[in-house]
């Protein structure tokens, strides 16, 4: 989704929860 949009889509991209967790930890700099 681009900035300023309302994202209503449930699965717009091929990512898994495991991918998201790893990305989240990395981005948070934990």
């Amino acid at each position: 989704s681009s900035t300023g949009s309302i994202d209503m889509v449930d699965s717009p991209q091929l990512a898994t929860l495991a991918d998201e967790v790893s990305a989240s930890l990395a981005k948070q700099g934990l």
Epitope: S1, V9, A15, E20, S24
Partner: antibody, heavy 116, light 110 residues
Framework: QVQLQESGPSLVKPSQTLSLTCTVS????????VAWVRQAPGKVPEWLGA???????YYNPALKSRLSITRDTSKSQVSLSLSSVTTEDTAVYYC??????????WGRGLLVTVSS | QAVLTQPSSVSGSLGQRVSITCSGS?????????VGWYQQVPGSAPKLLIY???IRASGVPDRFSGSRSGDTATLTITSLQAEDEADYYC?????????FGSGTRLTVLG
């Protein structure tokens, strides 16, 4: 400074839809994930779902049929909608930065009571 | 029934070492999926202690450590302090959903 704040009604009637909003500051809902967690009085926290940085949404399978999570990037908000509520949905509802294994910043929580 | 099973309570005396286990399965903890550990005192939101199974969060004393062996993750607290008395939860994920453990109440004995 990273902050999250839950807002919405504190009292909802049975069978209605509970709608909550999480407004964040200090980070972006585009590039970071936001999770929703609830905790009934005296009970274990329950992961409801999350808005991933990819744009994907993830849901607790036990609640998926009643649950919807959306994000509004222009307002830095992630919203939760839970339909057909019962008294079992009475809980403190939290939003937090992250998904699960590294949820480092939490909102203060909002107690929502389901009662007629 | 919780996907992640913890002892309902553990206790230890001041200065002692205690461990809290989090038993999962080959679909989550045993698969190598990350585990987080949270501390919660009544009336407050959970506080992150350990992320990525074994990494201390910022500002968490080095008395707290996390590890994993097979399907079980463990939180160890050395040199127990009075302020450690709280509820502790592990958390992990499998497939496309996540969950918290059943929770452990830690009592610190005088």
């Amino acid at each position: 400074q990273v902050q999250l704040q839950e807002s919405g009604p504190s009292l909802v009637k049975p069978s209605q839809t509970l709608s909550l909003t999480c407004t964040v500051s200090g980070f972006s809902v585009i590039s970071d994930s936001v999770a929703w967690v609830r905790q009934a009085p005296g009970k274990v926290p329950e992961w409801l779902g999350a808005s991933g940085s990819s744009g994907n949404k993830y849901y607790n399978p036990a609640l998926k049929s009643r649950l919807s999570i959306t994000r509004d990037t222009s307002k830095s908000q992630v919203s939760l909608s839970l339909s057909s509520v019962t008294t079992e949905d009475t809980a403190v509802y939290y939003c937090a930065r992250g998904i699960i294994a590294g949820v480092d910043v939490w909102g203060r929580g909002l107690l929502v009571t389901v009662s007629s | 029934q919780a996907v992640l099973t913890q002892p309902s309570s553990v206790s230890g005396s001041l200065g002692q070492r205690v461990s809290i286990t989090c038993s999962g399965s080959s679909s989550n903890v045993g698969y190598g999926n990350y585990v987080g550990w949270y501390q919660q005192v009544p009336g407050s939101a959970p506080k992150l202690l350990i992320y990525g199974t074994a990494i201390r969060a910022s500002g968490v004393p080095d008395r707290f450590s996390g590890s994993r062996s097979g399907d079980t993750a463990t939180l160890t607290i050395t040199s127990l302090q009075a302020e450690d008395e709280a509820d502790y939860y592990c958390a992990s994920y499998q497939s496309n959903y996540a969950f918290f453990g059943s929770g452990t109440r830690l009592t610190v004995l005088g």
